[in-house]
């Protein structure tokens, strides 16, 4: 995990200023409004049952 201004986060992750660490882009499916998701490629929508079980 990197501080801002150093090497970028590893592939598949993005820096979260809110959490002060690199976060997995995969979690943007569950938490799409997280700040780090702006640095991730558009996440696919969650399966129907995850959003509205």
């Amino acid at each position: 995990e990197q501080a801002p201004g150093t090497a970028p986060c590893s592939r598949g992750s993005s820096w979260s200023a809110d959490l002060d660490k690199c976060m997995d882009c995969a979690s943007c499916r569950a938490r799409p409004h997280s700040d780090f998701c702006l640095g991730c490629a558009a996440a696919p929508p969650a399966p129907f049952r995850l959003l509205w079980p």
């Epitope: 995969a26 979690s27 569950a30 938490r31 996440a43 049952r49 079980p53």
Partner: antibody, heavy 119, light 111 residues
Framework: EVKLEESGGGLVQPGGSMKLSCVAS????????MSWVRQSPEKGLEWLAE??????????HYAESVKGKFTISRDDSKSRLYLQMNNLRAENTGIYYC??????????WGQGTTLTVSS | DIVLTQSPASLTVSLGQRATISCRAS??????????MQWYQQRPGQPPKLLIK???NLDSGVPARFSGSGSGTDFTLNIHPVEEEDAATYYC?????????FGGGTKLEIK
């Protein structure tokens, strides 16, 4: 240091009720999805219930086996998680873990509290 | 519900060798980009501990001797080189949909 501490387990008769509590510290409780997971020799690890965030209107989800019987709730002001369990049966016996995750995984686990349903 | 089947149920590995644990899902838990599979370690008398999330991503503080791979329905946890402290039961867990489910566990013994 992250800490989750469950309480409220014990012995209860079939058909009885019990409320489990979990107090959290060391992380931003109100930004974490919280769940209860049960472990028993018969069924292994079973996810039971989840409660999301205030921004999700505290959406709750349940395993089919506990739907209508168990109710999960949280109090962000006290960093507490609860599980109200009604109409308990022998198959509800097990170790109940309070767990927290930023998203759809379980980052943090308590040590567990044991519930025994028996006459 | 998605059923996760782990194999083997138990295995014994010599110190310093490789342990390989498999988890098969009854349906795909992957998109084109990500796989929604986690791995946990549970030592006797302790709660489970997150090792790997989203199939390949090590949780913070987890030693690099642990690695995860796979996509779709077939996933693998590798431990190499195995150390004595790795003696534990390992579980997979999917987060593709609700209900989340766990595998039945694989007990790893070290000789």
């Amino acid at each position: 240091e992250v800490k989750l501490e469950e309480s409220g387990g014990g012995l209860v008769q079939p058909g009885g009720s019990m409320k489990l509590s979990c107090v959290a510290s060391g992380f931003t409780f109100n930004n974490y999805w919280m769940s209860w997971v049960r472990q028993s020799p018969e069924k292994g690890l079973e996810w039971l219930a989840e409660i999301r965030l205030k921004s999700d209107n505290y959406a709750t989800h349940y395993a089919e086996s506990v739907k209508g019987k168990f109710t999960i709730s949280r109090d962000d002001s006290k960093s507490r998680l609860y599980l109200q369990m009604n109409n308990l049966r022998a198959e509800n016996t097990g170790i109940y873990y309070c767990t927290g995750g930023f998203a759809d995984y379980f980052d943090y686990w308590g040590q567990g509290t044991t519930l025994t349903v028996s006459s | 519900d998605i059923v996760l089947t782990q194999s083997p149920a138990s295995l014994t590995v010599s110190l310093g060798q490789r342990a390989t644990i498999s988890c098969r899902a009854s349906q795909s838990v992957s998109t084109s980009s990500y796989s929604y599979m986690q791995w946990y370690q549970q030592r006797p008398g302790q709660p489970p501990k997150l090792l790997i999330k989203y199939a390949t991503n090590l949780d913070s503080g987890v030693p690099a001797r642990f690695s995860g791979s796979g996509s779709g329905t077939d996933f693998t946890l590798n431990i190499h080189p195995v150390e004595e402290e790795d003696a534990a039961t390992y579980y997979c867990q999917h987060s593709w949909e609700i209900p989340y489910t766990f595998g039945g566990g694989t007990k790893l013994e070290i000789k």
